[in-house]
Interface confidence: low
């Protein structure tokens, strides 16, 4: 599995003078010059930094660098008809009205264009009502107060905070529950680290500062407008009463000083509990409506927020394989930011763009990679991760018979504590292997490898000595690689420690304070957590590409598929009653991942034994391990989300960030207890174990001998 | 308490036939898997039989397979092993235990065993 | 079968010695393997569940590791009721194997 065999070459030219090549005043300086003005999607800026990209691509030696557009929906605020949110008495006066935009950074305070915050795509709409709190605006949450506290939230504008799942799974959330308006806010608990100073004296979140982002409720369909298919100049366009995963309801941000004032009148009820409160100095009431002296007074939303059909631009870059051109391993990360996007997402676009002047610098000295290496910069991703869907739209038959792997490269830092790594059972080796070989840019472990602190800062919690990986879920741009079309993908950033933080973010996320000073000063002024992430991530994609047998380890596969199996297994075996009552038996997707497990082990052998130098056995053994991750793909996909297709691994219903392990099984056993026809709700379960059971076994089968 | 209570061992002759039971307490029989595991004197552990919650699916070591059965009554709390053609080597002392995680990893509680002789 | 090897067959160890028994799987077993302690004449006690995972009221002197073929159990600082026979035992396939135990006797 060495790379050193890779084609065209010297022996200098291996994964060690690609690492070499990477430098961390580049990265520092690349991020620097993409953080000057906002990159919006859809707006002149991003189109010139598209160009700007190209050209130095080009310059750094790619065979081709093409801009791919497209025509998509998008959302921006109505210049002339500010967003706002007010309190208003028993006249119909607004006696409290929220800020129109975040007080600009020092330095900053006359760049044009700073989007003022807002929620992309939120429909229009003026609702006053009474207010509910519905803490984190969970599915959880909201049976805590539907069934236990018997609150109605039906017509009412439900507030929720920032943090733990995706914001378009809380929106989703309170439509469901009859909410006529949704207002975020980012809660100083979860936006506010102890100890910590806020911007721009340190890196937490000011009072003023507010998370920008998109509410959709896409599952992975790309252009609302144009599901399934590129959004290209001759598209048919749905109509916006057809449109996919738009919210019904208006939906608006707002910052902690603005949320203090709405919710220390709240009345109603208290909070269920100590997990219900945040940090401001505020009851954490759950209302409905404000207490007493205030109770005549409402809560109106006022949004003037516009979609539009506007043109994106991908920047794709190629670096043909000498060996094996027809085979894509693919880098790929997003370019337009919020605002300047300091840490999301041009952390990572200044990676990538190191890494792109590093494989330039080996061509021009005669090295190809073995196989084809396509390099991406994404456009629309906080628009839903719209360039990389409607670009894999347009090119899924290549993909879907030539797409090796999928590396992401969205932001590069999200603390500077250590590693964090999602990605397929197949990358585990791949990665643990490179990690060994990296060294540590953590204080304390100098001279000690990247897999040492990282095993160290975040154990397996499966096995001693080894680190965590997690499942990949979505939220970014490997959505449409992984979960449509079943190619093996892989995510790596330096994180903090995250053990009680799962999902909230940095504080200053999504905020105009996403700065290149952010960066430079308060988390990564040698920028050698970027030079590390720019290794990881490079290095993945250079061992992908060039090494003779592609580093996959199926036999890791077999390892998960038993213990998500043993977890669905466990969650089902709550209801035993029902599981005899209607013959419920997980027989069949427990002999299946024994059977993938048995020929897993029988290839893993073939594989160390056969002859590397014949070349028609070398791809025959390559395909099998290229189409593996594809074998997981159910052509019709989950009940309801057609375009999540992988049996084993979706974006949680509950939270799209979070992964799910055999998601149509989970579904169907999520709340049965309360489904009207138990009969059909467990006939469901069977048909998803059946699924999920004939799934694992055909992946199986393709690794076993062909002949 | 979590128990589990073997009886019905004893002297059998090669040949003859043997009935165990294990009587279980302080949990939810139906919801777990459950195993036979044997020792013969002053030698090691060796598994001899699973069964699932309901007594659907049943496991059997490969040289057990046709003599010995395993089955449940869940309205008796109670596990069963059905020894036929018993022969010498099937002397040992036969441990019930409760299966658990998932399928039937791990074995999380014992009962004291019962003693199987099979000797003319 | 999947055959467990366990090494040594036998240990000698003194009260607050570090021990180690090792377990070997003939083929790659994942992370599917669990520990017992048996003293004579009682039934087995589950010690280590899934190579390494604690079982509750187990004392944290008690420890699993490895992955794959090769597993070890070790006893930090050996204590009087530690004396006993050990065994691994494997989930991965059926037919589940034990190994044929390590016999830990005092010194």
């Known amino acids: 599995k060495s790379s050193n065999e890779a084609t065209n070459i010297t022996p200098k030219h291996n994964m060690k003078a690609f690492l070499d090549e990477l430098k961390a005043e580049n990265i520092k300086k690349f991020l620097y010059n993409f953080t000057q003005i906002p990159h919006l999607a859809g707006t002149e800026q991003n189109f010139q930094l598209a160009k700007q990209i190209q050209s130095q691509w080009k310059e750094f030696g790619l065979d081709s660098v093409e801009l791919a557009h497209y025509d998509v929906l998008l959302s921006y605020p109505n210049k002339t008809h500010p967003n706002y949110i007010s309190i208003i008495n028993e006249d119909g006066n607004e006696i409290f009205n929220t800020s129109l935009f975040e007080p600009p950074p020092p330095g900053y305070e006359n760049v044009s264009d700073i989007v003022p915050p807002f929620s992309a795509f939120s429909p229009q709409g003026m609702p006053e009502g009474d207010l509910v709190y519905v803490n984190y605006a969970r599915t959880e949450d909201f049976f805590k107060l539907e069934r236990d506290m018997k609150i109605n939230c039906s017509g009412k504008i439900v507030i929720a905070r920032y943090g733990k799942v995706f914001r378009g799974n809380k929106v989703k959330n309170a439509q469901l529950a009859g909410a006529k308006g949704v207002i975020l806010y980012s809660d100083p608990a979860d936006y506010f680290a102890p100890g910590v100073k806020s911007y721009p004296d340190g890196w937490n979140l000011p009072g003023g500062g507010v998370q920008r982002g998109n509410i959709l409720n896409l599952n992975g369909a790309g252009d609302p407008l144009t599901p399934g298919y590129p959004a290209n100049e001759y598209a048919y366009r749905r109509g916006i009463a057809e449109a996919v995963g738009l919210p019904s309801i208006p939906v608006h941000p707002i910052g902690y000083y603005d949320a203090q004032k709405l919710l220390e009148k709240m009345g109603g009820s208290a909070p269920p509990d100590s997990s219900w409160r945040g940090s401001l100095k505020v009851p954490y009431n759950v209302g409905p409506g404000f207490t007493g002296n205030f109770s005549t007074q409402k809560v109106k939303m006022h949004i003037h927020s516009t979609n539009e059909v506007t043109r994106i631009y991908n920047v794709i870059g190629t670096l043909r394989g000498a060996v094996e051109p027809d085979r894509y391993v693919i880098l790929g990360g997003h370019r337009d930011s919020w605002v300047f996007g300091g840490i999301d997402p041009q952390s990572g676009a200044a990676v990538v763009h190191e890494i792109v002047r590093s494989f330039g610098t080996l061509k021009k000295e005669g090295w190809r990679p073995r196989r084809t290496i396509l390099f991406a910069s994404w456009d629309a991703e906080e628009f839903g991760l719209l360039g990389s869907t409607e670009w894999a739209e347009e090119n899924s038959r290549l993909l879907q018979e030539r797409g090796v792997a999928y590396i992401n490269a969205d932001s590069s830092i999200e603390g500077n504590y250590t590693l964090r790594v999602d990605c397929t059972p197949l990358m585990y080796s791949l990665v643990h292997n490179l990690t060994k070989e990296l060294k540590s840019p953590d204080e304390g472990f100098e001279g000690k490898s990247l897999y040492e602190s990282w095993t160290k800062k975040s154990p397996s919690p499966e096995f001693s000595g080894m680190p965590r990986i997690s499942k990949l879920g979505s939220g970014n741009d490997f959505e449409v690689f992984f979960q449509r079309l079943g190619i093996a993908s892989g995510r790596a950033r330096y994180t903090k420690n995250w053990e009680t933080n799962k999902f909230s973010g940095y504080p200053l996320y999504h905020s105009v304070y996403e700065t290149y000073e952010l960066v430079e000063k308060f988390y990564d002024p040698m920028f050698k957590y970027h030079l590390t992430v720019a290794q990881v991530r490079g290095g993945m994609v250079f061992e992908l590409a060039n090494s003779i047998v592609l580093p996959f380890d199926c036999r890791d596969y077999a390892v998960v598929l038993r213990k998500y199996a043993d977890k669905i297994y466990s969650i089902s075996m709550k209801h035993p009653q029902e599981m005899k009552t209607y013959s419920v038996s997980f027989d069949s997707l427990f002999s299946a991942v024994k059977n993938f497990t048995e020929i897993a082990s029988k290839f893993s052998e073939r594989l160390q034994d056969f002859d590397k130098s014949n070349p028609i056995v070398l791809r025959m053994m390559n395909d099998q391990l290229m189409f593996l991750e594809r074998a997981f793909i159910d052509p019709l996909g989950l009940p309801d989300r057609p375009f999540y297709r992988h049996v084993i691994y979706a974006p949680s219903s509950h939270n799209k960030y979070a992964g799910e392990s055999f998601p149509g099984i989970y579904d169907a056993l999520f709340d049965i207890e309360s489904k009207v026809d138990p009969s059909k709700a467990w006939g469901e379960v069977k048909r998803q174990i059946y699924v999920a059971a004939f799934t694992v076994q055909a992946a199986a089968e393709t690794l076993s001998e062909v002949a | 308490e979590v128990q589990l209570v073997e009886s019905g061992g004893g002297l059998v002759q090669p040949g003859g036939s043997m009935r165990l039971s294990c009587a279980a307490s302080g949990f939810t029989f139906s919801d777990y898997y459950m195993a036979w595991v044997r020792q013969a004197p002053g030698k090691g552990l060796e598994w001899v039989a699973n069964?699932?919650?309901?007594?659907?699916?049943?496991y059997y070591a490969d040289s057990l397979k046709g003599r010995f059965t395993i089955s449940r009554d869940s309205s008796k709390n109670t596990l069963y092993l059905q020894m036929n053609s018993l022969r010498a080597e099937d002397t040992a002392v036969y441990y019930c235990?409760?299966?658990?995680?998932?399928?039937?990893?791990?074995?999380?509680?014992w009962g004291q065993g019962t003693t199987v002789t099979v000797s003319s | 079968d999947i055959q467990l090897t366990q090494s040594p067959s036998s240990l000698s160890a003194s009260v607050g010695d570090r021990v180690t028994l090792t377990c070997r799987a003939s083929q790659s077993i994942s992370n599917n393997l669990h520990w017992y302690q048996q003293k004579p004449g009682k039934a087995p006690k589950l010690l280590i569940k899934?190579?390494?995972q604690s079982i509750s009221g187990i004392p944290s002197r008690f420890s699993g590791s490895g992955l794959g073929t090769d597993f070890t159990l070790t006893i930090s600082s050996v204590q009087p009721e530690d004396f006993a026979t050990y065994y691994c035992?494997?989930?991965?396939?059926?037919?589940?194997?034990f190994g044929q135990g390590t016999k830990l006797e005092i010194k």
């Open positions: 235990a409760r299966a658990l995680d998932g399928y039937y990893g791990y074995l999380d509680v």
């Open positions: 035992q494997q989930s991965n396939s059926w037919p589940y194997t």
């Open positions: 899934y190579v390494s």
């Open positions: 069964i699932n919650y309901d007594g659907t699916s049943t």
